[in-house]
């Protein structure tokens, strides 16, 4: 390596206000826990002739680090050890040979809070940019997954529900998806940022909750969304007290309820009363019941909360890392209410059994 042991021209911080050495970076960046952020950064360093052919090494250090003793949090120097707690999560994404010191942080953790400074080394030219420093603020994860239900749900007919975290970023560790549902389910395909649950609803699944929980294990943070399955009974021109389905699987509108009830107003009224009663009981029961499913690898126990009105403690934990890209500012989730999904029952009597067993399905 050329002039490897030449006396450094500039000592770290010795010329903090040196106009020949400058760095441009935002002084503060905010990232939600478990998510990621890319901080643009450029710097300039004058180089004497004897270092012009030397490789440029860049380093990001925590504020207060002693260069000779402490490892950086990120560097492009391959044989350089980095801090264990930031390894693989902090990356010097920019190319220092092109004066780019951009820093990428994925799977942001609470303990990443703090200030960081950049240092360049090129042969015997070495300089720590003590100003400006980058201040990283890690805030609560406010993003929540979205659950997509294509059309209406029909009893006995399978539907693909998709839980997605489109706000997660590609660079992070893919999250763990966990589904919690009383209805018969199986797992469909998953992508980096979405999971498909195949649900085959039954009449008794009316009023039950379906939860998609997403764990960003890289940061030990969990977020979830719960929707409530709203079951609507749709008779098919009844002739007896039992309404078998025709097997066509065709979707009917809510208007079908009215048409089917004209020939038997008494039956319809009674049925409506039963449904309302069942719905009320299930809803009340659901609010009181604590749904708890215990998972393994509870290395970072966190409590994911449903909406403020329907808080149900959940301890679903599984090892995964994050992959979310929040920008510098957190996004506020607008919808904090429970969502209602409609299950249309064609020609089936609602079950009188209101007790519900929940099953948990996980995808990693």
């Amino acid at each position: 390596m050329p002039l490897l042991l030449l006396l450094p021209l500039l000592w770290a911080g010795a010329l903090a206000m040196d106009p020949n050495f400058w760095l441009q970076v935002q002084e503060s960046v905010t990232v939600q826990e478990g998510l990621c952020v890319l901080v643009p950064c450029t710097f300039f360093h004058p180089i004497p002739y004897y270092d012009k052919n030397s490789p440029v090494h860049g380093y990001w250090f925590r504020e207060g680090a002693i260069i000779s003793r402490d490892s950086p949090v990120a560097t492009n120097k391959l044989d350089q050890e980095v801090q264990e707690e930031t390894q693989g999560r902090f990356r010097l994404l920019g190319d220092p040979s092109r004066n780019n010191c951009s820093l990428s942080i994925v799977d942001a953790r609470r303990r990443d809070n703090g200030s960081y400074f950049f240092r360049m080394e090129r042969g015997s030219t070495k300089y720590s940019y003590k100003s400006p420093q980058l201040s990283v603020h890690v805030t609560d994860l406010t993003h929540r997954p979205k659950i997509l239900i294509p059309g209406t749900l029909e009893p006995g007919h399978s539907k693909n529900l998709t839980c997605s975290v489109s706000w997660a970023c590609e660079q992070g560790t893919p999250p763990i998806f966990s589904w919690l549902s009383a209805a018969p389910t199986s797992l469909g395909p998953r992508t980096t940022h979405s999971s498909v649950l195949i649900i085959t609803p039954r009449p008794q699944d009316h009023g039950t909750n379906l939860t998609c929980q997403v764990k960003f294990a890289g940061a030990g943070v969990t977020t979830e969304r719960t929707i409530q399955l709203n079951v609507t009974y749709v008779p098919q021109n009844p002739t007896t007290g039992i309404f078998p389905g025709d097997g066509s699987g065709k979707q009917e509108t809510r208007a079908g309820v009215v048409h089917g009830a004209i020939g038997g107003a008494g039956v319809t009224a009674l049925l409506a009363l039963c449904l309302c009663l069942i719905f009320f009981i299930v809803k009340t029961h659901r609010r009181k019941a604590a749904r708890t499913a215990v998972g393994r690898n509870d290395t970072h126990p966190t409590t994911g909360s449903a909406s403020p009105k329907h808080q149900k403690k959940s301890k679903l934990h599984g090892p995964t890392e994050t992959s979310s890209c929040s920008g510098a500012a957190p996004t506020v989730e607008m919808d904090e209410e429970l969502h209602y999904a409609s299950l249309n029952f064609h020609g089936m009597n609602p079950s009188k059994d209101t007790s519900t067993e929940y099953s948990e399905v996980r995808t990693q």
Partner: antibody, heavy 116, light 107 residues
Framework: QVQLVQSGGDLAQPGRSLRLSCAAS????????MHWVRQAPGKGLEWVAV????????YYGDSVKGRFTVSRDNPKNTLYLQMNSLRAEDTAIYYC?????????WGQGTLVTVSS | DIQLTQSPSSLSAYVGGRVTITCQAS??????LNWFQQKPGKAPKLLIS???NLEPGVPSRFSGSGSGTDFTFTITNLQPEDIATYYC?????????FGGGTKVEIK
């Protein structure tokens, strides 16, 4: 203490060759880049050549490029300047210089006279 | 090549007086400039590196400043032993180049 002792200066005819030596002592020779600088009588300083600590990179001033060769023998702690195709304008005192951040140590200089 | 224009080429000053020498580079050289002192019959001696850093053992009456293309070398409280020729030299890029020199004499 650091010393750079030069030798090899002489009178040479145009077109002939000379080899200058610079023996280093008092420091770890292979840690340092080394330069040759010259000064024609009554004139200013002119940079001639540089060689990297490991000998891997060498650079020359325009006026000597292709005629002079700088080399070093690290085990012997010695720097060389091979001067071929000498010209009258190469007449000067030649200095070897140690590079440590800046040019902190110079040899005593050796006179090369090119004349017919 | 980077040219260094040094001025004046010679000057005369009183003992205890102040001497200022300028060195202008043909292009920006950041702070990569040395100042040397050469006394008759001797090898040059480095006084200032990096445009303004005084070398160890050099009296504090010598100073340097500047960055980019314009540099200044100053001797305050001129002493008889300061009679010499002073050179600036850039090491921003190869080939390394020197200014033409400034000869300082005592009045």
């Amino acid at each position: 203490q650091v010393q750079l002792v030069q030798s090899g200066g002489d009178l040479a005819q145009p077109g002939r060759s000379l080899r200058l030596s610079c023996a280093a002592s008092g420091f770890t020779f292979d840690d340092y880049a080394m330069h040759w600088v010259r000064q024609a009588p009554g004139k200013g300083l002119e940079w001639v050549a540089v060689i990297w600590p490991d000998g891997g990179q060498k650079y020359y001033g325009d006026s000597v490029k292709g005629r002079f060769t700088v080399s070093r023998d690290n085990p012997k702690n010695t720097l060389y300047l091979q001067m071929n195709s000498l010209r009258a304008e190469d007449t000067a005192i030649y200095y070897c210089v140690r590079h440590f951040n800046a040019w902190d140590y110079w040899g005593q200089g050796t006179l090369v006279t090119v004349s017919s | 090549d980077i040219q260094l224009t040094q001025s004046p080429s010679s000057l005369s000053a009183y003992v205890g007086g102040r001497v200022t020498i300028t060195c202008q580079a043909s292009q920006g050289i950041s702070q990569f400039l040395n100042w040397f002192q050469q006394k008759p019959g001797k090898a040059p001696k480095l006084l200032i590196s990096d445009a303004s850093n005084l070398e160890p053992g050099v009296p504090s009456r010598f100073s340097g400043s500047g960055s980019g293309t314009d540099f200044t070398f100053t001797i305050t409280n001129l002493q008889p032993e300061d009679i010499a020729t002073y050179y600036c030299q850039q090491y921003d890029d190869l080939p390394l180049t020197f200014g033409g020199g400034t000869k300082v004499e005592i009045k």
